[in-house]
Every structure is written in C-alpha cells, then in structure tokens.
C-alpha cells in the first residue's frame, strides 16, 4: 500500500468505536483506531476522511463528525461533542465556549435582541445557574493531528475549534 495512512494505535475508546460502528458494522475485522475526523473502512483496509462520506447513506460510520459538519454551517450554533448535539449559542450566552464568542459578543452589544435573563446578567443580576456554570469553562481544543490517510486535509483554526470542542 502506498499513500494511504495506517491507523493509529490507541486513539479511541471501545465506546466511541461502537458509536461509529453500530450493529456490528463490518464485522469480522479488527476495529482500527483512526484520527478523530476519520473512520476505518474495512473494505479499503485504511482510514478514510469522514468528510468524503457525509453525503452518503453510510455516514453512520461518521455520524458525530457529519453532524458537527452540518451544524457548523448553521450560524450561531456549534457542535458539542460531549452532548453529541448541535447547540444554539443564543441559549448559552453568558457561560458560552469560545465557539460562541463571536455570536454572543455581538448579541451583548445589541441588548435589544437579548432575552430578559441575559439582559439581567448584563446589569449585574447574574443568576446562579449551577446546571450550566462550569459546563463550558476552560474549553480548549486538543489540537488537530495531520491526517495520515488524507494528508491534504487540513482544518482551519475555526474548524479545529469546532471539531475538537
């Protein structure tokens, strides 16, 4: 084989692998670990970029990545990997991660558009929202590893921040 990257050892937990390969998808093959934005294609015998299959039926092998990809296309939203959901920045401004900084800071500059609880926060009446208060503190992306299978695939700083939240 040439040009196509070998999979990385370690990398993903079994739980993550099961989420990416539901119902014993492509059985009879040792599951391989691939970088975050890739999946193991057992017929090709290599890691493949999830980007290539997000428009296919088979995107189930990359469900989380593909959801995050479509989520980032929506303004004022970001994909939360822990919740595995597309989150509206408007609902968390005030305790927002950096993915929402641009959206929330713009919102705060125009208080007319803010919901009452956020207007209260601006005037110092910050509610003690213990459910969310620490949920988004200190969120740092873990950095992007160059993809061995697709060395041409490089994520921009914005994309990295969103994909590796």
């Amino acid at each position: 084989m040439s040009g196509l990257g070998r999979s990385r050892r370690g990398g993903r937990s079994r739980v993550d692998q099961e989420e990416r390969f539901p119902q014993g998808l492509w059985t009879g093959v040792a599951m391989r670990s691939c970088p975050e934005e890739q999946y193991w294609d057992p017929l090709l015998g290599t890691c493949m970029s999830c980007k290539t299959i997000c428009n296919h039926q088979s995107q189930r092998t990359c469900a989380a990545f593909c959801r995050s990809l479509s989520c980032r296309k929506e303004q004022g939203k970001f994909y939360d990997h822990l919740l595995r959901d597309c989150i509206s920045c408007a609902s968390i401004c005030g305790q927002h991660p950096k993915q929402c900084a641009y959206f929330c800071e713009n919102k705060l500059r125009s208080p007319v558009n803010l919901p009452p609880e956020l207007r209260r926060q601006r005037s110092g009446e910050v509610e003690n929202n213990s459910d969310n208060s620490g949920r988004y503190q200190g969120l740092e992306h873990r950095g992007s590893e160059a993809s061995p299978a697709l060395p041409g695939l490089k994520l921009s700083a914005d994309q990295v921040a969103l994909v590796y939240s």
Epitope: M1, S2, G3, L4, G5, G24, L25, W26, T27, G28, V29, D41, P42, L43, L44, G45, T46, M48, S49, T52, I53, H56, Q57, S58, A149, L150, P151, G152, L153
Partner: antibody, heavy 118, light 107 residues
Framework: QVQLVQSGAEVKKPGASVKVSCKAS????????MHWVKQKPGQGLEWMGY????????KYAQKFQGKVTMTSDKSTSTVYMELSSLTSEDTAVYYC???????????WGQGTLVTVSS | DIQMTQSPSSLSASVGDRVTITCRAS??????LNWYQQKPGKAPKLLMC???RLHSGVPSRFSGSGSGTDFTLTISSLEQEDFATYYC?????????FGGGTKVEIK
Amino acid sequence: QVQLVQSGAEVKKPGASVKVSCKASGYTFTNYVMHWVKQKPGQGLEWMGYILPYNDGTKYAQKFQGKVTMTSDKSTSTVYMELSSLTSEDTAVYYCARYDYEGSFDYWGQGTLVTVSS
Amino acid sequence: DIQMTQSPSSLSASVGDRVTITCRASQDISNYLNWYQQKPGKAPKLLMCYTSRLHSGVPSRFSGSGSGTDFTLTISSLEQEDFATYYCQQGNTFPPTFGGGTKVEIK
C-alpha cells in the same frame, strides 16, 4: 448523472506496457475511491486495486503488486491504470468501478479490452 | 482472503420462472453482500447492495436475503432481459472478492 468512460481497446506485444484511462463525470471526482477489476475472456471478476484521487493513495491486490500502477489527474477527473511487462495472462477486459462507501461498486466503466499477442 | 462460492454455476429457465441463486462466504460477512448483473460484452451493473437494498432503477422482481455466510438472490418472475450472468461480492473485509458467477440461460 454519474458516468465512467474508459479508453479504447489496445493490442500490445509481450513485454510492453499499456495505460488504460477512465474519465469520471457527474460527481465530485476527489470524493470517491476508484477501483479496477480484471475479467479474462469467459471468466469471472477479479479485484486489482484502488486509487483515492484525493491524494493519489493506492492499494493493490497482492497478485498485482509490481504489475499495476494506478494514478489520477484531478484536472481532467481521470484515473489511469498501467500494466507493465505484459504477457498473454494480461489479456482481459479491465473495468474501472466507483466505490460507494457501503462495500459495493455502484458505477462501472464500459471496460477496455487489452490483448497481448506477438 | 474471503472466498465466495456461487451455485449453481449455470441454470436454464423460462420467462416467468422463479429463479434463486445462492452465494456462500468462507467466513461471516454480516450483511455486506452485493449482487451484480452482467450481460455479454457489457460491464457489470450493481443490482443490490447490503444483501437486500435494490440499487436505483433495479426492478422489484429482484430480491435478496441472508446474513453471515449464506445469501440468496431471487428473481420472482424471470423476464427476457434478466438472462445474464450474476456475481456476488463481499464488501465486509479487505480485499473485496467476487463469486465465480451464475449464468442464467434460456431453457
């Protein structure tokens, strides 16, 4: 609609090389893996290898290592399959086939007959 | 490599007949079994993928079943254009492998 158009039939002498082309249209060329399949006259289908046009990554069947070289040209959405040191065993129809990421080959070229004869 | 064995290698049938072709894998391939139809001088065409999912444009008289190692392709009522050679292919494990083919001829 998806189309894979292959180059015409070739007649070659033993020891020579041949390069077969497969021009893709109707989809994003770099998003799909292209495979090549060999079919000897009156026989079944034999998988040879594949190329990922995104980065020209290739993987060949063990049997074809050293015999086949696959390349692609993104500017013309064309993949190439070159066979070297031809013998009569290489006389066959060669097909390019697009991989659908579900384990199957959803679209095929019309085939290129390569005849090796002295 | 996974071996794919098709049976019968050929069969004779008439228009309107129900035809069944079987394909056996040498090891478990889950449901990653595909069927192709090939007519003389033409390229193979994908009929069905993932055991029973019809490819676009394929008539509903074709159906597939099975899982693990044993699979069948059924043509409920054979039509003139169905006389061809049929190949199975496993899509579960590298490298992809094909069955030897089943030729459906006119009786």
